[in-house]
């Protein structure tokens, strides 16, 4: 886990509301775990951050992630330039100035130090329709989700509607 206090002392002040020129509608500090209750942890190695999926020891503290939720207008296909509703997107930041980032070329999920405004690769469309879990779909690559592969996070292509329920793209959010 990060050996820095910022992850536990997150405040709104650390993330001003200039991200992509819009303010998050809400922010939430939570631990992230898989459908099978493995924890997502972040470690500093050789001056870069690695993301792991692992079982924690009984009293080991879970790493927290700041989830910032944004709404974007969803254009209506039927009504020309009208608006259907909203797409709920999220950015995930485990420590100040670092965000989860989709690397579509490598099919990987990485932690990048990003300048604001954040790039589209840092935004994920939120799904919440299965087993009170959430899924994170790449804004830049629809149909591709953050998932678990070989004890790491990876980008996983979901082909059919049934596969949206596949356990390796489902995550749990917890305040504890």
């Amino acid at each position: 886990a990060f050996g820095i206090s910022g992850v536990q002392k997150y405040t709104r002040a650390l993330h001003d509301s200039s991200i992509t020129g819009i303010s998050p509608i809400t922010e939430y500090l939570a631990s992230l775990s898989t459908y099978n209750d493995q924890s997502i942890t972040f470690a500093l190695e050789d001056e870069s951050y690695e993301i792991y999926v692992e079982d924690l020891k009984k009293d080991e503290k879970k790493d927290k992630v700041l989830l910032s939720y944004y709404e974007s207008q969803h254009p209506s296909n039927e009504s020309g330039d009208g608006v259907d509703g909203k797409m709920l997107m999220v950015t995930l930041s485990p420590t100040k100035d670092f965000w989860l980032h989709a690397n579509n070329k490598e099919h990987s999920v990485e932690l990048h130090k990003c300048e604001k405004p954040l790039p589209d690769q840092a935004f994920f469309v939120l799904h919440n329709m299965h087993s009170n879990c959430v899924s994170f779909e790449c804004k830049t690559d629809p149909g591709v989700f953050i998932g678990v592969k070989d004890n790491h996070l990876a980008l996983i292509k979901v082909d059919s509607s049934e596969n949206l329920c596949t356990e390796n793209i489902l995550f749990k959010l917890s305040e504890t």
Epitope: I25, T26, Y28, Y69, E71, H74, S76, N77, E78, S79, D84, G85, K86, M87, L88, V125, L126, H127, N128, M129, H130, N132, E137, S160, S161, E162, N163, L164, C165, E175
Partner: antibody, heavy 122, light 107 residues
Framework: EVQLVESGGGLVQPGGSLRLSCAAS????????MSWVRQAPGKGLEWVSS????????NYADSVKGRFTISRDNSKNTLFLEMNSLRAEDTAVYYC???????????????WGQGTLVTVSS | DIQMTQSPSSVSASVGDRVTITCRAS??????LAWYQQKPGKAPKLLIY???SLQSGVPSRFSGSGSGTYFTLTISSLQPEDFATYYC?????????FGGGTKVEIK
Amino acid sequence: EVQLVESGGGLVQPGGSLRLSCAASGFTFSSYVMSWVRQAPGKGLEWVSSISGNGGSTNYADSVKGRFTISRDNSKNTLFLEMNSLRAEDTAVYYCAKSLGTTTTFLGFDYWGQGTLVTVSS
Amino acid sequence: DIQMTQSPSSVSASVGDRVTITCRASQGISSWLAWYQQKPGKAPKLLIYAASSLQSGVPSRFSGSGSGTYFTLTISSLQPEDFATYYCQQANSFPLTFGGGTKVEIK
């Protein structure tokens, strides 16, 4: 203009079945989570069921699980609720509702139909 | 399941009054709370989503606040068309649940 029009309600005996339909127009139906919410006469609102835009994920209230089935036909912009083994306590106005968010119920329901009354009585 | 407790169950008020309705969740729901207005014989209407975001077309006299387990809906200056029943709804987890409703009546 978004429109949701329910149909299929009526009087049915306990143990009977009904199929409710909700015809949607004015928005990209297949992009949105859709739900059924009911309201017993003189009572409050009760969520019944939700279905994802592609139909791959569904959720149900415990009170209807195993008896009701939600489905959708995106080619016809129609939402369904198949209701079996109906009980007196299922008597209510049933509303079809569109989620404000495309892929999530986190933002609530921004459009509702006018409702269709289901009466379960012998 | 998450229980939503609304109070008061009814309130008598006059045009121009400030009205506040509260909603408590039995466990934390972040900011995933919606408020609806319902008039007799009509479908509910979304007023507020994500605890404090005003739905398009809703007058600015309506406002929402709160997070976690405690939320409020405030009508800053009650208008004749605001006499109705108001419901909160937690949108955080399934099963989705509504509060019991607050009826705003004419004093």
